[in-house]
């Protein structure tokens, strides 16, 4: 807390300008009117202040707006945003995408801080859904943003927003998140032709069911091994050797290097060894010839 001291003669700020640049903490407190600061916040970003000085300016705004800052002030916070706590931000009502962009710009280069996470949360809740423009903005600043959302939160993403998603935005998504995103992507890209569709849908395939993988295997897509390894194990297991061969195309040879890793390992265990041998890759661990395979799950379903 800054002590209340009288402003020295001739030091009263008539406007926010660089004459304040070397004011001591107590001088800023005594000589800068909070209402003046609020109306001239845009000027603060043209003046280099120390963090200590920024603390004083924040304190003034807090006193002026105990219920939370108006958006006209928030939009021009600049580096002062770095001084805000999540508790401060929860009092805000941010509706303009321009305001969001301005504050994310200040935080550029930093990891997503609790302040930024709170800001985004407030903004998205205020909008009701994660629309394309917002998603575009957020993933531009934070490529991992989508994967930081829960499946429940992802359910509010409209399919139209999926067009803004880049492959790197999904790098850290887990299967539960891709389960939610995949149907949206399928819907978003449904009117594209085969090869273009595959390019767009590829990053989302970690959420694809077996029937969609079977359909893709009929389209000469040549899926790479990196994508195949990210597929759901339960979706890969029912695929036949012929279907996997068609799905991977020339990349099928990569199965040998991955034979000890899921989902390849589990898939091999489900295939007849003779079928695996047709690939000529030396894959071992399939069901020996002459063995009868009982699908117990099917039996249970029938009973």
């Amino acid at each position: 807390e800054v002590e209340k001291t009288a402003c020295p003669s001739g030091k009263k700020a008539r406007e926010i300008d660089e004459s304040l640049i070397f004011y001591k903490k107590w001088e800023l407190e005594a000589c800068v009117d909070a209402a003046l600061l609020a109306t001239q916040m845009d000027r603060v970003n043209a003046i280099p202040f120390t963090y200590e000085q920024l603390d004083v300016l924040k304190h003034k705004l807090d006193e002026l707006y105990p219920q939370g800052y108006p958006e006209s002030v928030i939009q021009h916070l600049g580096y002062l945003f770095l001084k805000m706590s999540p508790e401060d931000i929860r009092k805000w009502n941010v509706t303009s995408l321009e305001t969001l962009k301005a504050l994310l710009e200040v935080n550029k280069g930093h990891e997503m801080s609790p302040q930024v996470a709170t800001l985004i949360d407030r903004f998205v809740k205020g909008r009701g859904q994660l629309d394309k423009d917002t998603l575009d903005t957020l993933t531009a600043f934070y490529p991992g943003y989508l994967c930081s959302l829960s499946p429940e939160e992802l359910s509010s993403v409209p399919p139209s927003s999926i067009w803004a998603v880049r492959p790197q935005d999904l790098d850290t998504c887990d299967p539960r998140q891709l389960d939610v995103l995949y149907p949206k992507a399928r819907l978003a890209f449904q009117n594209m032709n085969g090869s273009e569709y595959f390019v767009k849908i590829q990053s989302f395939l970690g959420g694809a069911p077996t029937e969609d993988l079977k359909a893709l295997s009929q389209q000469n897509v040549s899926m790479d091994l990196a994508t195949f390894m990210k597929l759901r194990t339960d979706a890969v297991l029912p695929l036949t050797v012929a279907e996997v061969q068609k799905l991977l195309g020339p990349h099928v040879e990569g199965l040998k290097a991955e034979e000890r890793h899921r989902p390849v390992r589990d898939w091999i265990l489900r295939q007849r060894q003779d079928d695996l041998d047709t690939l000529g890759l030396g894959l071992q661990g399939g069901i020996p010839n002459g063995y009868l395979v009982l699908d117990l799950s099917m039996q249970e379903a029938l009973s």
């Epitope: 660089e18 004459s19 640049i21 070397f22 903490k25 603060v44 970003n45 043209a46 003046i47 280099p48 202040f49 120390t50 963090y51 200590e52 000085q53 600049g78 580096y79 770095l82 001084k83 280069g109 930093h110 990891e111």
Partner: antibody, heavy 119, light 106 residues
């Protein structure tokens, strides 16, 4: 090209005076606060003085207060440091440095000019 | 505010992970910058706001910390990284620098 170029250094006797200049190019000079930072031979960096974009506000380290004067001529894109009553401990390479627009760290430095105070 | 860097010098090999610390005599939030200086050259900004990488600086450099304790890390030392590194606080006036850490070839 964005750059800063210092000049004016040299050998001077204790008690003498020297004026350093720093010519700026490649950016809007008047929009940025500027600083002088020095480095004694084999030693670390020391912030000496700073000036606001318009030149209206100045700051000095206690070690040079009353002896050094910082100024700028925005029409010539030049920063100055007038050094009077020089002492042996003022011997150093003097760098001029540009402050970023909002905070007090330096994103551009000159190559420096050596000031030697010796009898 | 006094900034104390440690170690004052260190020997390392190309490919090594190098960590330099900077301790402030009082809390400075994240108001810290790191600079690299090579002999006879001007300092060069590497990191600002304790952890933000300056544009054009290789990603092997990273900064962390807040309050009084800060760290500069070089994940895999390259031949061009042998230099002296300085921290600087911009929390309040007067601005101050650490004493420097010289990184030498082992």
């Amino acid at each position: 090209e964005v750059q800063l170029l210092e000049s004016g250094g040299g050998l001077v006797q204790p008690g003498g005076s020297l004026r350093l200049s720093c010519a700026a190019s490649g950016f809007t000079f008047s929009s940025y606060a500027m600083s002088w930072v020095r480095q004694a031979p084999g030693k670390g960096l020391e912030w000496v003085s700073a000036i606001s974009g318009s030149g209206g506000s100045t700051y000095y380290a206690d070690s040079v207060k009353g002896r050094f004067t910082i100024s700028r001529d925005n029409s010539k894109n030049t920063l100055y440091l007038q050094m009077n009553s020089l002492r042996a401990e003022d011997t150093a390479v003097y760098y001029c440095a540009k402050v970023i627009r909002q905070l007090w760290y330096f994103d551009l430095w000159g190559r420096g000019t050596l000031v030697t105070v010796s009898s | 505010i006094q900034l104390t860097q440690s170690p004052s010098s260190l020997s390392a090999s190309v490919g090594d992970r190098v960590t330099i610390t900077c301790r402030a005599s009082q809390g400075i939030s994240s108001a810290l910058a790191w600079y690299q200086q090579k002999p006879g050259k001007a300092p060069k900004l590497l990191i600002y706001d304790a952890s933000s990488l300056e544009s054009g600086v290789p990603s092997r450099f990273s900064g962390s910390g807040s309050g009084t304790d800060f760290t500069l890390t070089i994940s895999s030392l390259q031949p061009e990284d042998f230099a002296t590194y300085y921290c600087q606080q911009f929390n309040n006036y007067p601005l101050t620098f650490g004493g420097g850490t010289k990184v030498e070839i082992k």
